[in-house]
Interface confidence: medium
Amino acid sequence: AGHLEQPQISSTKTLSKTARLECVVSGITISATSVYWYRERPGEVIQFLVSISYDGTVRKESGIPSGKFEVDRIPETSTSTLTIHNVEKQDIATYYCALWEAQQELGKKIKVFGPGTKLIITDKQLDADVSPKPTIFLPSIAETKLQKAGTYLCLLEKFFPDVIKIHWQEKKSNTILGSQEGNTMKTNDTYMKFSWLTVPEKSLDKEHRCIVRHENNKNGVDQEIIFPPIKTDVITMDPKDNCSKDANDTLLLQLTNTSA
Amino acid sequence: AIELVPEHQTVPVSIGVPATLRCSMKGEAIGNYYINWYRKTQGNTMTFIYREKDIYGPGFKDNFQGDIDIAKNLAVLKILAPSERDEGSYYCACDTLGMGGEYTDKLIFGKGTRVTVEPRSQPHTKPSVFVMKNGTNVACLVKEFYPKDIRINLVSSKKITEFDPAIVISPSGKYNAVKLGKYEDSNSVTCSVQHDNKTVHSTDFEVKTDSTDHVKPKETENTKQPSKSCHKPKAIVHTEKVNMMSLTV
């Protein structure tokens, strides 16, 4: 089955610059399928823009200005790129790539979409570091004692733009855990958001990760915030040498003792 | 030009109570097009739900039912037993037939219908209230309450800033909420909640322990390290005494 990944969840540009949005195709050979690009402007319907077929033919929607969008594909990396030239305010939108995935029955095919990339246009000069800054909260003793469960909370602050994705996993597992989150809130020129995960007592002795995707993460990789295991008797901490966990680094977690 | 028009912009649904979304086609006969439904959830993920002729996306067949009503020129999507996971914007879209019956493979979308999910009407439930702290940050966690109306107060004389609470549906079909704030005196902050004409305090839930059980940490354990250095904690820490963690990146 075809699967589409758009690694950039957002792309921030200043006026008149060029934006390049990527779409990675897996599960199907890119040179044997057509890739479509759609856009969703705020408050408008999702609209087809341009496609590149398996033989390289490009088809643009009528009414789309020529020279505005360019689409190509790189079979070696199984990637299609949408290039938006001379970005202007009216290009602010979420851009989706898509492909038709044929089912195993006659006439049965579906169009699957990538997760989208939001194009943001700003005239602001922002601080050098506008990546999400994490603060973590461990379960209160009262909750673990009374409810045989514990809630981890992951607070992310001082990031720009506002587009952010947060999910939770246990260490050594790729299963995404069911979590809850607040709305993204504006604080001065940046944003904050928090997400929380409630786990049963039997899972408190496992390490958990709050995984954050943001355009301005260091090295462009997901930030992983480690929540140590909570044992009912004792825990030992064994962080690695580096302080922030981008990809394979580990965050320093400094325990502070309180009697709650 | 054809247009797909959703019946409603917003549809509130209750958990477990079937709901129907409708989308009418203007300017053409719906029979000349194949109808598709998609759902966009938080984070913009566009997921395929249904395409005419009983094609369903993974995990949708048991809880969704798509149909077209040729006579009324309508596309219909039924959510048979909504859950909190079904919240999102629902889009109808059609594949188009070009001139002379030639098939073209772009989709034409309608505007989305925002589906908001509410818990089923149920007996009132009093919340549990817990406080979590880290440095100047305090979070008040309010769990498993019904109905939704609630006021959460973080009680402090030295407020730096407070944020609006997040109120969400819990997996059990009640509500959970979290309110965050920053306070100079975070150690003394408590949380009080007004719900259903009653007040619930975080202190009501604190675990009573013997005074001998309050083991003071060694100085080294409780010292914040400079932001660029990384140290291993030197001792085993009894987690029963720990509900805070500070982070230096």
């Epitope: 044997a32 399928t33 057509s34 398996y54 038709w100 044929a102 195993q104 029955e105 006659l106 006439g107 095919k109 | 029979g31 000349n32 194949y34 005419e52 002729k53 009983d54 149909d67 077209i68 009503d69 040729i70 006579a71 037939l97 019956g101 030639e102 098939y103 493979d105």
Partner: antibody, heavy 123, light 107 residues
Framework: QVQLQQSGPGLVKPSQTLSLTCAIS??????????WNWIRQSPSRGLEWLGG?????????NYAVSVKSRITINPDTSTNQFSLQLNSVTPADTAVYYC?????????????WGQGTMVTVSS | DIQMTQSPSFLSASVGDRVIITCRAS??????LAWYQQKPGKVPKLLIY???TLQSGVPSRFSGSGSGTEFTLTISSLQPEDFATYYC?????????FGQGTKLEIK
């Protein structure tokens, strides 16, 4: 206008292979909006859909369970036709065989039919 | 497989009569039903698709209705050329299946 022209033998011996061809004019076997089907009709079974083929950036086939182990439907883009092969036939396969176009815009209903070929399975 | 059952199997009527043929599906097929007419020694001819849409060139005295499991084909005023066998076909899920037919004869 679209037409389908069938060809193939009217008599096949038991255990042998029944082979029929359907030539398309006025449409393409690689059309994005059509499926190409084989149907048979006998007094005992009535109308019975056997299977079909269609092209949507690659070729797909779908067959009726009753004949799945014995049937092959092949498109031929060079001659713009499609064929039916039914292996290991028995007298129960005696029927009139039709090819037909299933049209996307008609929700796969069969709007164009071949003239039919009466096939008798007998030694 | 979805079973399609037509009733009646035989029907005698006169020119000018209003005739109704019923088709029942063993499970819901939404509106994905077609009706065909077949005269002796001829190929089937498509009359109606998606339960109620008339194929181009088919006289308006033919109409179809229904959805789910119950469908009807109505001929409002029988003409001499309408005496034939009529078949319904479900196109909702594979394998496509036909009804056993309704033979419409002159009374």
């Amino acid at each position: 206008q679209v037409q389908l022209q069938q060809s193939g033998p009217g008599l096949v011996k038991p255990s042998q292979t029944l082979s029929l061809t359907c030539a398309i004019s006025g449409d393409s076997v690689s059309s994005n909006s059509a499926a190409w089907n084989w149907i048979r009709q006998s007094p005992s079974r009535g109308l019975e859909w056997l299977g079909g083929t269609y092209y949507r950036s690659k070729w797909f086939n779908n067959y009726a369970v009753s004949v799945k182990s014995r049937i092959t439907i092949n498109p031929d883009t060079s001659t713009n036709q499609f064929s039916l092969q039914l292996n290991s036939v028995t007298p129960a396969d005696t029927a009139v065989y039709y090819c037909a176009r299933g049209e996307w815009g008609l929700r796969d209903a069969f709007d164009i039919w071949g003239q039919g070929t009466m096939v008798t399975v007998s030694s | 497989d979805i079973q399609m059952t037509q009733s009646p199997s035989f029907l005698s009527a006169s020119v000018g009569d209003r005739v109704i043929i019923t088709c029942r599906a063993s499970q819901g097929i939404h509106s994905y039903l077609a009706w065909y007419q077949q005269k002796p020694g001829k190929v089937p001819k498509l009359l109606i698709y998606v339960a109620s849409t008339l194929q181009s060139g088919v006289p308006s005295r033919f109409s179809g209705s229904g959805s789910g499991t119950e469908f009807t084909l109505t001929i409002s005023s029988l003409q001499p050329e309408d005496f034939a066998t009529y078949y319904c076909q479900q196109l909702n899920s594979y394998p496509w299946t036909f009804g056993q037919g309704t033979k419409l004869e002159i009374k």
